[in-house]
């Protein structure tokens, strides 16, 4: 799993793209998104 900290420092990624990746993972893993 990729941590939020790592994702936020992944250069070239927009904030929406990070939200997108988190939400896709949430739909699979049912982690809480808040």
């Amino acid at each position: 799993a990729v941590s939020e900290h790592q994702l936020l420092h992944d250069k070239g990624k927009s904030i929406q793209d990070l939200r997108r990746r988190f939400f896709l993972h949430h739909l699979i893993a049912e982690i809480h998104t808040a």
Partner: antibody, heavy 118, light 116 residues
Amino acid sequence: QVQLVESGGGVVQPGRSLRLSCAASGFTFSSYGMSWVRQAPGKGLEWVATISSGGSYTYYPDSVKGRFTISRDNSKNTLYLQMNSLRAEDTAVYYCARQTTMTYFAYWGQGTLVTVSS
Amino acid sequence: QLVLTQSSSASFSLGASAKLTCTLSSQHSTYTIEWYQQQPLKPPKYVMDLKQDGSHSTGDGIPDRFSGSSSGADRYLSISNIQPEDEAMYICGVGDTIKEQFVYVFGGGTKVTVLG
């Protein structure tokens, strides 16, 4: 291979209800979020509903919120869309779609036509 | 709000290169989008997701003649050596999560005609 087969469409009067089904095969159904997307005759695509892998989380656009309910039975590998208080503008082909880790609507069914008319 | 704009139609000669444009609303210019292909009387098919930096991932069975690129709020789908089977509607889409609510919108689509 991923297969999604929708059923339950037909002609229904305004104000009535209809339940659509989507039978899934070729993958572990309980591992993926699923969605419904519709397309009115001669028109563009419109996202209708999304549900998480275990069914705990559901999402809807304002156009159907409170009228449509997405659900799933993972023991039957089946996705559902309960449509209440149907309107003429709900007339469309309804597609079910499966997500991947990379995208929302990676695989699509063939669709089922819903016609709301008196 | 989140809006995608596409030209309604485009025509290309057989074997030519095609470049289709999907434009995001200005305040959403950094967003990742998706491209879909819908051949006549068929369901949509996922083509690729396309990020602001032009990187993209293509769907199952999509020929490598299809590629993507980005510039500002514009997202491009390019088709090299266009073939008769590429005649279809090409639709872009974009999703976002706002305050734990999900929203997904589609562009109106560009109808591609292959001539000759």
